[in-house]
């Protein structure tokens, strides 16, 4: 059965997945897909890496961890109820049928209704893209609103704070961890 993770509408969801590269930077291709892991590849791919970096992506999906050390956990920015469902993390180890597959269930809950807070920094308005500890370059025009010139390393901690802290507990006990080499 899938490991279950929860987030509220409007939050960033976090789906953990890890492997241990044979050597730092000696990466194994990874894909993330919406839907349970099929026999090969990922269905409905939302993000993919090759041996070097992220080479396929969709706008709200990011790898916030140090994927060159095997942290390929997926962050989904500003989730909606439609993001609920099974996600596949597939570690594409070379060789026939060597892939490691992890199915993770994401449950999105409606946002809690709270009194209007005192004015806070609107993170997604100020920085419409998700933020990561490694640069992913300039804003794309599919993003609404203007994006100031930002330093991603300085504000990655803000992105981390947006994670539902409950999802961060006992990540490495989730079973979504393998060792390669």
């Amino acid at each position: 059965s899938e490991v279950e993770y929860r987030a509220e509408v409007g939050q960033n969801a976090y789906l953990p997945c890890f492997y241990t590269p044979a050597a730092p930077g000696n990466l194994v291709p990874v894909c993330w897909g919406k839907g349970a892991c099929p026999v090969f590849e990922c269905g409905n791919v939302v993000l993919r890496t090759d041996e070097r970096d992220v080479n396929y992506w969709t706008s709200r999906y990011w790898l916030n961890g140090d994927f060159r050390k095997g942290d390929v956990s997926l962050t989904i920015e500003n989730v909606t109820l439609a993001d609920s469902g099974i996600y596949c993390c597939r570690i594409q180890i070379p060789g026939i049928m060597n892939d490691e597959k992890f199915n993770l269930k994401l449950v999105i809950k409606p946002a809690k209704v709270t009194p209007a807070p005192t004015r806070q920094r609107d993170f997604t308005a100020a920085f419409p893209r998700m933020l990561t500890t490694r640069g992913h370059g300039p804003a794309e025009t599919q993003t609404l609103g203007s994006l100031p010139d930002i330093n991603l390393t300085q504000i990655s901690t803000l992105a981390n704070e947006l994670r539902d802290s409950r999802l961060a507990n006992d990540l490495r006990d989730s079973g979504a961890t393998i060792r390669i080499g």
Epitope: W57, H136, E140
Partner: antibody
Framework: QVQLQESGPGLVKPSQTLSLTCTVS?????????WNWIRQPPGKGLEWMGY???????SYNPSLKSRITISRDTSKNQFSLKLSSVTAADTAVYYC???????????WGQGTTVTVSS | DIQMTQSPSSLSASVGDRVTITCKAS??????VAWYQQKPGKAPKSLIY???YRYSGVPSRFSGSGSGTDFTLTISSLQPEDFATYYC????????FGGGTKVEIK
């Protein structure tokens, strides 16, 4: 093996629009990566101009944003650069390059020289 | 925008020398730096990405290091084919390049 090849006129008149095309072979531009334009004025350094991603979204250097358009023709596996209102300062070698989401550039075209002159 | 200041702008060295090129970012760019080699009339070639990872096929004499604002490209033992111009590039924000370092034969 991925290959990129720039093409277009080598001479453009001031105030006109520079148009270049990059033809990609060995990889579908819709399958992944960001497809970039980078230029290098004679004897000078490199300047990133912008990209179009595998999904069709674009991103431009703020200094060129009012003049630049990058588009693609997926049926021909090509992407194109248009730069309007050119001046002599736009004289350069123009490269197309394949980049990652983090835009660093593993594959480059051979480059094409464009001179802006009347 | 983020400025990348490369030094020296040129250097003379002999085959077998150890060569070090530095690049300083105007603000913190993490490890989001790449290095390229360019020979006259040719397109740049990728050497290093993410500050320290060697691109496939690049000889082991090339190495990169640094994080934050200070980065270094080292050629441990210069070979005849290494005489070229080298550029650093940051990609923490929209990409910007250093001004280049020309490595010439002494």
């Amino acid at each position: 093996q991925v290959q990129l090849q720039e093409s277009g006129p080598g001479l453009v008149k001031p105030s006109q629009t520079l148009s270049l095309t990059c033809t990609v072979s060995g990889y579908s531009i819709t399958s992944g990566f960001a497809w970039n334009w980078i230029r290098q004025p004679p004897g000078k350094g490199l300047e990133w101009m912008g990209y179009i991603s595998h999904s069709g979204s674009t991103s431009y250097n703020p200094s060129l944003k009012s003049r630049i358009t990058i588009s693609r023709d997926t049926s021909k596996n090509q992407f194109s650069l248009k730069l309007s209102s050119v001046t002599a300062a736009d004289t350069a070698v123009y490269y197309c390059a394949r980049g990652y989401r983090s835009p660093w550039f593993a594959y480059w075209g051979q480059g094409t020289t464009v001179t802006v002159s009347s | 925008d983020i400025q990348m200041t490369q030094s020296p702008s040129s250097l003379s060295a002999s085959v077998g020398d150890r060569v070090t090129i530095t690049c300083k970012a105007s603000q913190n760019v993490g490890a989001n730096v790449a290095w390229y080699q360019q020979k006259p009339g040719k397109a740049p070639k990728s050497l290093i990405y993410s500050a320290s990872y060697r691109y496939s096929g690049v000889p082991s004499r090339f190495s990169g290091s640094g994080s934050g604002t200070d980065f270094t490209l080292t050629i441990s033992s210069l070979q005849p084919e290494d005489f070229a111009t080298y550029y650093c590039q940051q990609y923490n924000s929209y990409p910007t390049f250093g001004g280049g370092t020309k490595v010439e034969i002494k």
